[in-house]
Amino acid sequence: CDLPQTHSLGNRRALILLAQMGRISHFSCLKDRHDFGFPEEEFDGHQFQKAQAISVLHEMIQQTFNLFSTEDSSAAWEQSLLEKFSTELYQQLNDLEACVIQEVGVEETPLMNEDSILAVRKYFQRITLYLTEKKYSPCAWEVVRAEIMRSLSFSTNLQKRLRRKD
């Protein structure tokens, strides 16, 4: 499955939108930094068959979409930027879902690498727990926004590697 060129443009647009979403000076949030334990090893792209890599990417985008679709998120971010960001993520999910169906048929492998999917889910659970503990403060959201930008960058790099394998 070849992810369309529009998919990588969508990735870039999503990152740009996320960068634009900042509402407070992030310099005031230094002490709120937190180790969310991003599962970097799940995104190095070496140990995966393509179908498994795509399913991990799908989970990453799905969880990001879920995180930014909550009421708390709506209260934290400028609405039009948030809607555009969610739309980009939704389009990426559609692209990835189409690819998952194709790849599973080709490789005849299980849909998901369960351990990798679980690692991504636990990562987002830690993010949600952090936001809850910080009472969804502006700085907590800034830290999470920075973290998601970093994790989406890893996702983008994995997608680039997958395209090079084609």
């Epitope: 960068a19 900042g22 000076s25 992030h26 310099f27 005031s28 949030c29 230094l30 002490k31 709120d32 930094r33 937190h34 180790d35 969310f36 800034e142 830290v143 920075a146 973290e147 930008m149 970093r150 960058s153």
Partner: antibody, heavy 121, light 107 residues
């Protein structure tokens, strides 16, 4: 390979202006902040200020606020430190260093080689 | 501003010695404390970040500990290349501040 390459040594007269540079390579320039640190001859390290190249937001140490200006041009992955009117007391080595921003990663993990600024009449 | 106080300001030690440098913050900084090594004419080098995490490529003889206001950098067995000046730096809030430095000299 991550690198921060600073502009060369400068010799200036009091009252002159100056802009020194720090060019980042080998990483996503807008994903890290760039900090500036002063070291006067035989003295310790002093943090001057920092810039987020993604939006050019800046923060300064109160000691340096109004004395220097930090800027960045993300199109050429370069941060700048400038003076509008140098004083003899600005004679020092100036370092730039990258900072991970709000991410949980090592602070100031890569440094430039330093730019020696000498101000003398 | 958060004041950082290092002690001692200088020390003399021999190769193989265990060396301890302390750093105290004027208010709690949790674990937001970094340690740097600087040799004459060179840029500082990050050794330890977030109080106890060893920076990639730094020898394991270097270790950091502490939280709140009191922190320690330990060199378990001093090597010839370790003679340098060491700085702590709080990473808790702006303005970032450094300790005044500890010069480790050959006895």
């Amino acid at each position: 390979e991550v690198q921060l390459v600073q502009s060369g040594a400068e010799v200036k007269k009091p009252g002159e202006s100056l802009k020194i540079s720090c060019k980042g390579s080998g990483y996503s320039f807008t994903s890290y902040w760039i900090g500036w640190v002063r070291q006067m001859p035989g003295k310790g390290l002093e943090w001057m200020g920092i810039i987020d190249p993604s939006d050019s937001d800046t923060a300064y140490s109160p000691s340096f606020q109004g004395q220097v200006t930090i800027s960045a041009d993300k199109s050429i992955s370069t941060a700048y430190l400038q003076w509008s009117s140098l004083k003899a007391s600005d004679t020092a080595m100036y370092y730039c260093a990258r900072h991970p921003g709000l991410n949980w990663a090592p602070d100031f993990d890569y440094w430039g080689q330093g730019t020696l600024v000498t101000v003398s009449s | 501003d958060i004041q950082m106080t290092q002690s001692p300001s200088s020390l003399s030690a021999s190769v193989g010695d265990r060396v301890t440098i302390t750093c105290r913050a004027s208010q709690s900084i949790d674990e937001f404390l970094n340690w740097y090594q600087q040799k004459p004419g060179k840029a500082p080098k990050l050794l330890i970040y977030f109080a106890s995490s060893l920076q990639s490529g730094v020898p394991s003889r270097f270790s950091g500990s502490g939280s709140g206001t009191d922190f320690t950098l330990t060199i378990s067995s001093l090597q010839p290349e370790d003679f340098a000046t060491y700085y702590c730096q709080q990473a808790h809030s702006f303005p970032l501040t450094f300790g005044q430095g500890t010069k480790v000299e050959i006895k």
